[in-house]
């Protein structure tokens, strides 16, 4: 956030950044969580994302039977893998085609034993608040779905009747790691001395990190014709002063009238 | 990569023979081959298989009548086709597995590499 000066009083300002702003020659660059000519304001919102999407990855690991282990299938530049490869993805994305989540599967390692495959699983999906219970289903899924194939798709009189046989016995799921999109504690970070005071709020499945000096949202604080301010001892009310009221109170919501104050001074004068 | 060529289609009389060749352009060794076909309209069928050591397999329509051979050191598959019957008619394809494929049999799930056939027409 950036506020231009112009004039004379420039030379002034520069030295006069506050929070870690700098003078580019014209005005104050302000850290992010700043803004203002001299970068002395807080900011009422905080961008926190979040991601478009969230992905999982599941490490597996299968034994297929219908093809002879040999040495170059560890060269992934090889022939023998790059077939493979071919192969093997074709056929786990017909096994995991019902899942809407499932991205592909990339291979880590191939090791003897029939042909003992490494792989990842790659789940992606939309982000909404639920995505944890979304992305654990479809792990779930994932699950059934490679047990199953790796049930029925099996050698049967040293004949592979499918596009490829595995043992049953030789499936594992070794891991899941999620993608961690935790929207509060970004917000808390992100907010820095004043994370006690930033609160996420969302809107339309959408988080925002705002402060309560942020309007239009449930913890926004009504300072009426005052201005929100953020201090590190929280959102205060600066209450203004009009050509015929002065306004005081922790919301600014009570209002003096001047005309009754000089009155009442000249009264007693 | 390999490139498979098919020859030796054509319009023959029922009962009459054809002999099929396919000429790989790489290595076909250590590959399980085989034969499909597909008559017009309809599904493509596995003809009939063979491993890299010779073992066949074959559609139960064609069992008795068709022989798949190999000569790998001319990196050919060949099908001799006997007894050919109308039902026979189709587009002939040379079909060859991943490396190493092992438990093959006629049906084209294991094939990776195909030709771009040669037509078969059996007809008085």
């Known amino acids: 956030r950036t506020t231009t000066c112009f004039g004379d009083g420039c030379q002034n300002t520069a030295s006069r950044c506050k929070n870690g702003g700098t003078w580019d020659g014209l005005k104050c660059q302000c850290p992010n969580l700043y803004y203002g000519e001299l970068c002395e304001e807080v900011v009422s919102s905080i961008d926190i994302g979040p991601p478009e999407t969230i992905s999982a990855q599941m490490e597996l690991t299968v034994t297929v039977t219908s093809v002879k282990f040999t040495e170059e299938l560890k060269n992934h530049s090889s022939q023998e893998f790059q077939e493979f490869k071919q192969t093997f993805t074709e056929q786990m994305n017909i096994v995991y085609s019902g899942i809407p989540e499932y991205v592909g599967v990339n291979i880590t390692k191939l090791r003897l034993g029939s042909v003992v495959v490494e792989h990842d699983v790659l789940l992606r999906t939309k982000y909404t608040p639920e995505y944890k219970t979304v992305l654990d289903n479809a792990t779930e899924v994932v699950k059934e779905k490679i047990t199953k194939v790796t049930t029925q798709q099996i050698m049967i009189n040293d004949i592979c009747s499918d596009m490829m046989c595995f043992n049953t016995t030789g499936t594992q799921v070794q891991n899941i790691t999620v993608t961690q999109y935790d929207p509060e504690e970004d917000c808390r970070k992100m907010a820095k001395e004043y994370g006690d005071y930033f609160v996420v709020e969302y809107r339309d499945q959408k988080p925002y990190c705002i402060s309560p000096c942020e309007p239009g949202f449930s913890v926004s604080k009504n300072c009426n014709l005052g201005k929100c301010q953020m201090s590190l001892s929280g959102p205060q009310c600066l209450c203004v002063t009009t050509e015929t009221h002065w306004y005081s109170g922790e919301t600014c919501n009570q209002g003096t009238q001047k005309s009754l104050v000089y009155g009442h001074h000249h009264h007693h004068h | 990569e390999v490139q498979l060529v098919e020859s030796g289609g054509g319009l023959v009389q029922p009962g009459r023979s054809l002999r099929l060749s396919c000429a790989a352009s790489g290595d076909i060794t250590r590959r399980c081959m085989g034969w499909f076909r597909q008559a017009p309209g309809k599904e493509r069928e596995g003809v009939a298989g063979?491993?890299?050591?010779?073992?066949?397999g074959y559609a139960d329509s064609v069992k008795g009548r068709f022989t798949i051979s190999r000569d790998n050191a001319k990196n050919s598959l060949y099908l001799q086709m006997n007894s050919l019957r109308a039902e026979d008619t189709a587009l002939y394809y040379c079909a060859a597995s991943i490396l190493n494929r092992v438990g093959c049999r006629q049906l084209s799930y294991e094939y990776i590499y195909r030709g771009q056939g040669t037509m078969v027409t059996v007809s008085s």
């Open positions: 063979i491993s890299e050591d010779g073992i066949t």
